[in-house]
């Protein structure tokens, strides 16, 4: 009897949907795997007889409730199927936005870039898919624990009247108010304010 794949899960970030699993212990030899998805009552092959332990399902509809399954195979034998269900628009992880930060005297000027939708046009982002898309920003004085949060109304924000000659750190994430769903925080960007009026180059 061939044992089924273990720890089957969907790793989906920004609609890049990778079904992943682990190969079970099997003494007879190396296993291969077949992964399928349900398409109008019929399962369709996506990855056949692969030695990999993952399969890319990124072309699935973002808005559908999908049933996926994978099994292990050896020679003419195979394991039972392991099924999972997956709805990309509900289940995908919202990756960290991009952020550009410039210092202007005692202000930090920030511009936010929504994460790109994987496998689609470069100009299409997660903001296109989710109508309620907004950003959460948190900032703090470098070296302190107290963090301040704001919710910008646009794709940019200015933090004004900061302490001069002080390093502030900023990070941003996507947030969907209608789903109460938050994305991953970007890596902090830390910049030092000045107190003169020099314009950024």
């Amino acid at each position: 009897m061939v044992p089924p794949p273990e720890n089957v899960r969907m790793n989906s970030v920004n609609f890049k949907n990778i079904l992943q699993w682990e190969s079970p212990a099997f003494a007879k030899g190396n296993l291969t795997f077949t992964a399928q998805y349900l398409s109008y009552r019929i399962f369709q092959d996506k990855c056949m007889n692969t030695t990999l332990t993952e399969c890319d399902f990124s072309s699935l509809s973002k808005y559908g409730d999908h049933t996926l399954r994978v099994r292990a195979e050896f020679a003419d034998e195979h394991s039972d199927w392991v099924n999972i269900t997956f709805c990309p628009v509900d289940d995908t992880i919202i990756g960290p936005p991009g952020m550009q930060v410039e210092v202007l005297a005692d202000s930090l000027h920030m511009r936010f870039l929504a994460p790109k939708i994987e496998n689609e046009y470069e100009t299409w982002t997660m903001k296109n898919v989710y109508n309620s898309w907004t950003y959460n920003v948190q900032y703090w004085k470098n070296g302190t624990d107290e963090k301040f949060q704001i919710t910008p109304q646009y794709d940019f924000e200015v933090l004004r009247n900061l302490e001069p000659w002080t390093t502030y750190c900023v990070q941003v994430r996507g947030f969907l108010p209608d789903r109460n769903k938050a994305g991953e925080w970007s890596e902090p960007v830390c910049e030092q304010t000045t107190h003169d009026e020099t314009v950024p180059s």
């Epitope: 998805y37 349900l38 398409s39 109008y40 369709q44 072309s59 699935l60 509809s61 973002k62 808005y63 559908g64 999908h66 939708i117 496998n119 689609e120 046009y121 299409w124 296109n128 898919v129 109508n131």
Partner: nanobody
Framework: QVQLQESGGGSVQAGGSLRLSCAAS????????MGWFRQAPGKEREGVAA???????SYADSVKGRFTISKDNAKNTLYLQMNSLKPEDTAMYYC????????????????????WGQGTQVTVSS
């Protein structure tokens, strides 16, 4: 909620033509790829043609040179012009849409589209 309504199906002799239409309403997105699918009794639903938001098209091998997909963005309508029809084209034809999607690299599988019409029947007799 996106709603799709097909029309234009009917019965035709082999070698004849039909033009299917799919009227879309309830769009909350500005960009879609759309497709035509068909399903004959007892068979799988199969992709016929797809069109991208920028107008680029792709076709199943069985209909290349005979069918043409197009869309009128002003009217929110998708079309399928079917010429030189054959008895094997007999099926229920469905319109499908998927927001923020490119048809390139897609297999025109039904699971790749999130919104569907109810279908219109095409019957080709010999």
């Amino acid at each position: 909620q996106v709603q799709l309504q097909e029309s234009g199906g009917g019965s035709v002799q082999a070698g004849g033509s039909l033009r299917l239409s799919c009227a879309a309403s309830g769009y909350t997105y500005s960009s879609y790829c759309m497709g035509w699918f068909r399903q004959a009794p007892g068979k799988e639903r199969e992709g016929v043609a797809a069109i991208d938001s920028d107008g680029s098209t792709s076709y199943a091998d069985s209909v290349k040179g005979r069918f043409t997909i197009s869309k009128d963005n002003a009217k929110n309508t998708l079309y399928l012009q079917m010429n030189s029809l054959k008895p094997e084209d007999t099926a229920m034809y469905y319109c499908a849409a998927e927001p923020w999607c490119t048809s390139q690299g897609r297999g025109r599988e039904s699971a790749e589209f999130g919104y569907w019409g109810q279908g219109t029947q095409v019957t080709v007799s010999s």
